[in-house]
């Protein structure tokens, strides 16, 4: 009778950094330069990511892990794994199709990325504006107007005694 062959795939013995070489009797061969395998048992290696142009290398590719990119100064990463670089703007601006534009009145952006957002509407919380907003900063809300009116504190001082016959001034 024919002996049962081992069910284990010989390629499963090939560690990260190698591939299972079918041309050489399934022995483990090292990944060629500029490629990697991050898991064992792979039949091919993956080509390393190239950080070119506006991308710069944050972490070099190794035989077991891909290169990692970030963006050159003046740009910031977008997308998973920094798949895109987007131009920075100044605080108080947002990036449009025509480039960086100042935030419209009533909006602000306190970062070099993202969009201009509306100032907080203090009155929705029954508060007043303590510090006005700018293109770069949101408004600062203060106590409600009622909190600021005289005699509105929780502990009211006693009213001064009035002498009879004296009308209030």
């Amino acid at each position: 009778f024919e002996r049962t062959r081992s069910l284990q795939d010989p390629c499963s013995n090939c560690p990260a950094g190698t591939f299972c070489d079918n041309n050489r009797n399934q022995i483990c061969s090292p990944c060629p330069p500029n490629s990697f395998s991050s898991a064992g048992g792979q039949r091919t290696c993956d080509i390393c990511r190239q950080c070119k142009g506006v991308f710069r290398t944050r972490k070099e590719c190794s035989s077991t892990s891909n290169a990692e990119c970030d963006c050159t100064p003046g740009f910031h990463c977008l997308g998973a794994g920094c798949s895109m670089c987007e131009q920075d703007c100044k605080q108080g601006q947002e990036l449009t199709k025509k480039g960086c534009k100042d935030c419209c009145f009533g909006t602000f952006n306190d970062q070099k990325r993202g969009i201009c957002r509306p100032w907080t509407n203090c009155s929705l919380d029954g508060k007043s504006v303590l510090v006005n907003g700018t293109k770069e900063r949101d408004v600062v809300c203060g106590p409600s107007p009622a909190d600021l009116s005289p005699g509105a504190s929780s502990v009211t001082p006693p009213a001064p005694a009035r002498e009879p016959g004296h009308s209030p001034q």
Epitope: R24, S29, P32, N34, C45, I47
Partner: nanobody
Framework: EVQLLESGGGLVQPGGSLRLSCAAS????????VGWVRQAPGKGLEWVSA????????YYAESVKGRFTISRDNAKNTLYLQMSSLRAEDTAVYYC???????????????RGQGTQVTVSS
């Protein structure tokens, strides 16, 4: 048919130099990613050096940096490995290798030659 023929190996004393050649046929060496792989006695394959893409960017293993230089002569369709300051641990069979790119996006390599033996010993 793709063929790679290595030559230039031999016995050399520690500190000595050798130049290996790899004559390619069946493909244009300048249009491919190629390099050198070695196998020391009782050990697995180790990448030594490579020339990648048509721009000619080069790779060297840490163990040979500053001592080995890879180059190619496009007119002769030949790849070279200039080895200097040789050490006993450089003793191995040296193979010329050609990258193989697969449809799924992966990469392996192809060894078509018999290799050339380099022995560093006093």
């Amino acid at each position: 048919e793709v063929q790679l023929l290595e030559s230039g190996g031999g016995l050399v004393q520690p500190g000595g130099s050798l130049r290996l050649s790899c004559a390619a046929s069946g493909f244009t060496i300048s249009a491919e990613d190629v390099g050198w792989v070695r196998q020391a006695p009782g050990k697995g394959l180790e990448w030594v050096s490579a020339i990648l893409d048509s721009g000619g960017s080069t790779y060297y293993a840490e163990s040979v940096k500053g001592r080995f230089t890879i180059s190619r002569d496009n007119a002769k369709n030949t790849l070279y490995l200039q080895m200097s300051s040789l050490r006993a641990e450089d003793t191995a069979v040296y193979y010329c290798a050609r990258y193989v790119y697969h449809a799924g996006g992966g990469v392996t390599f192809d060894l078509r030659g018999q290799g050339t033996q380099v022995t560093v010993s006093s």
